[in-house]
């Protein structure tokens, strides 16, 4: 009962985490302009991973695409990568775990298989999740050094005279959705490998039966055969964890009344 | 088609208040205030988001006039308090359009503070 | 505050003539986040409300003949009336549409020669 609770529960929670990175993922707000210490605008900049905005005092709010791909940034591409390689191994991590979970039958499918694709659900659930914790930190940080870059060539101009003051951009909500969606899903995918543990059958201990003919004493023991099939407590981590490695390396606008907060 | 419509204006002793209204029909996102004081330029007043109500003013004006807006009705409010001669002024309402410039604008109405 | 200057304060003109009318910011109008300069005209006849000519520097107001353009970036700004015509004596004001508080030019008076 504890185990259905675990796999159930950490299915939950995964795809809870798997919709917040994928909700990060198109959020537009990346990056946000930095109103501290800033002289007020009456226009509000804010950068996504796909696109920039701009809002205006007058409810205007104007997108455009980076329709560009080799003139953005390579951190940007690689935080694209990761949010995408999160997304996709989550979604199939998720695809996995859906067959894998105890509360569902399908055919004469045997708990030793529900175990299997239990641990590799989980193992693709810890590295999305690690994959978007990465891709948000990494834009993170490229975040704060472009900060205080701009912060120390906040005011150029020439003889003091101020000619122009530079956008400085902080932290914009996505990056909190990332990184508490990214948690989430980690945490799901942990409980999937813990439920794992739980679902494999334990051993059953059989009384060696002796079958006597032409006078020699031969032994089956049907513990052995099951260990030797991979299935046995002695083997089945090991087993279970090789399968799950296997698998992890095969998947290798007019204004409205909202617009203006 | 938005249309704008000022009224309140009138003659008013020095250190008085005056509450000018500016009714509101079509499409209205953020409103001005602006005005112009005889022979002179344009001055902007203060400006204010009509779906929160987030105002934003000029230094001169800060503490002395307040923007407001009333959903229900649809209208802009300008409150003036300690007005002085130098107040005087015909006073617009205008719609922030794209660019943030001011594609509406009202008819005008004049406020005199004169003793 | 943003101070924005106008030139010439007033000028005359005959009907045909090709008017330019400049305009300073003391702080830079770009926005970098869409390139775009945030600074708007105003056309103005006496007794009646200014009339919206130019956004974003170089963008026309729809119903907003093509003799008008405007063209600068960063502080510096220009409105051009590429051949008068009798409507367009009136005063023309710049405004900086990117800071608040918003602020005007003290206005360019067009008058017949």
């Known amino acids: 009962m504890a185990v259905t609770a675990c796999q159930g529960l950490g299915f939950v929670v995964s795809l809870i985490g798997i919709a917040g990175i994928i909700a990060a993922t198109c959020m537009d707000q990346w990056s946000t302009q930095d109103l501290y210490n800033n002289p007020v605008t009456a226009v509000f900049n804010y950068q996504g991973l796909w696109r920039s905005c701009v809002r205006e005092s007058s409810g205007f709010t104007e997108c455009r695409g980076y329709f560009t791909l080799l003139g953005l940034p390579a951190m940007l591409q690689a935080v694209r990568a990761l949010m995408i390689v999160g997304i996709v191994l989550g979604a199939i991590g998720l695809l996995v775990s859906i067959f894998a979970l105890k509360c569902i039958r399908i055919g004469s499918m045997e708990d030793s298989a529900k175990a299997n694709m239990t641990l590799t659900s989980g193992i693709m659930f810890i590295v999305s999740g690690l994959c978007a914790i990465a891709g948000v930190s990494v834009f993170a940080n490229m975040l704060v050094t472009n900060f205080w870059m701009s912060t120390a060539n906040m005011y150029t101009g020439m003889g003091g005279m101020v000619q122009t003051v530079q956008t400085r951009y902080t932290f914009g909500a996505a990056l909190f959705v990332g990184w508490v969606a990214g948690g989430l899903t980690l945490i799901g995918g942990v409980m999937m490998c813990i439920a794992c543990r739980g679902l494999a059958p334990e051993e059953t201990n059989y009384k060696a039966v002796s079958y006597h003919a032409s006078g020699h004493s031969v032994a089956y023991k049907p513990g052995g055969f099951k260990a030797s099939t991979g299935f046995g407590s002695n083997t089945k981590n090991k087993k279970i964890y090789d399968g799950g490695a296997r698998t992890e390396d095969e998947v290798q606008s007019y204004p409205s009344k909202h617009d203006y907060v | 088609e938005v249309q704008l419509v000022e009224s309140g204006g009138g003659l008013v002793q020095p250190g008085g208040s005056l509450r000018l209204s500016c009714a509101v029909s079509?499409?209205?996102?953020?409103m001005n205030w602006v005005r112009q004081a005889p022979g002179k330029g344009l001055e902007w007043v203060a400006w204010?988001?009509?779906?929160?109500?987030?105002?934003t003013y000029a230094d001169d004006f800060k503490g002395r006039f307040t923007i407001s807006r009333d959903d229900s009705k649809n209208t802009l409010y300008l409150q003036m308090n300690s007005l002085r001669a130098e107040d005087t002024a015909v006073y617009y309402c205008?719609?922030?359009?794209?660019?943030?410039?001011?594609?509406?604008w009202g008819q005008g109405t004049l406020v005199t503070v004169s003793s | 505050d943003i101070q924005m200057t106008q030139s010439p304060s007033s000028l005359s003109a005959s009907v045909g003539d090709r008017v330019t009318i400049t305009c300073k910011s003391s702080?830079?109008?770009?926005?970098?986040?869409?390139?775009?300069?945030?600074l708007t005209w105003y056309q103005q006849k006496p007794g009646k409300a200014p009339k919206l000519l130019i956004y974003?520097?170089?963008t026309l107001e729809s119903g907003v003949p093509s003799r008008f353009s405007g063209s600068g970036s960063g502080t510096d700004y220009t409105l051009t009336i590429s051949s008068l015509q009798p409507e367009d004596f009136a005063t023309y004001y710049c405004?900086?549409?990117?800071?608040?508080?918003?602020?005007f030019g003290q206005g360019t008076k067009v008058e017949i020669k």
């Open positions: 205008a719609r922030s359009s794209r660019g943030n410039g001011f594609d509406y």
């Open positions: 079509g499409y209205t996102f953020s």
């Open positions: 204010i988001n009509m779906y929160t109500g987030e105002p």
């Open positions: 702080q830079s109008l770009l926005n970098s986040g869409n390139q775009k300069s945030y």
């Open positions: 974003w520097a170089s």
């Open positions: 405004q900086n549409a990117y800071y608040f508080p918003f602020t």
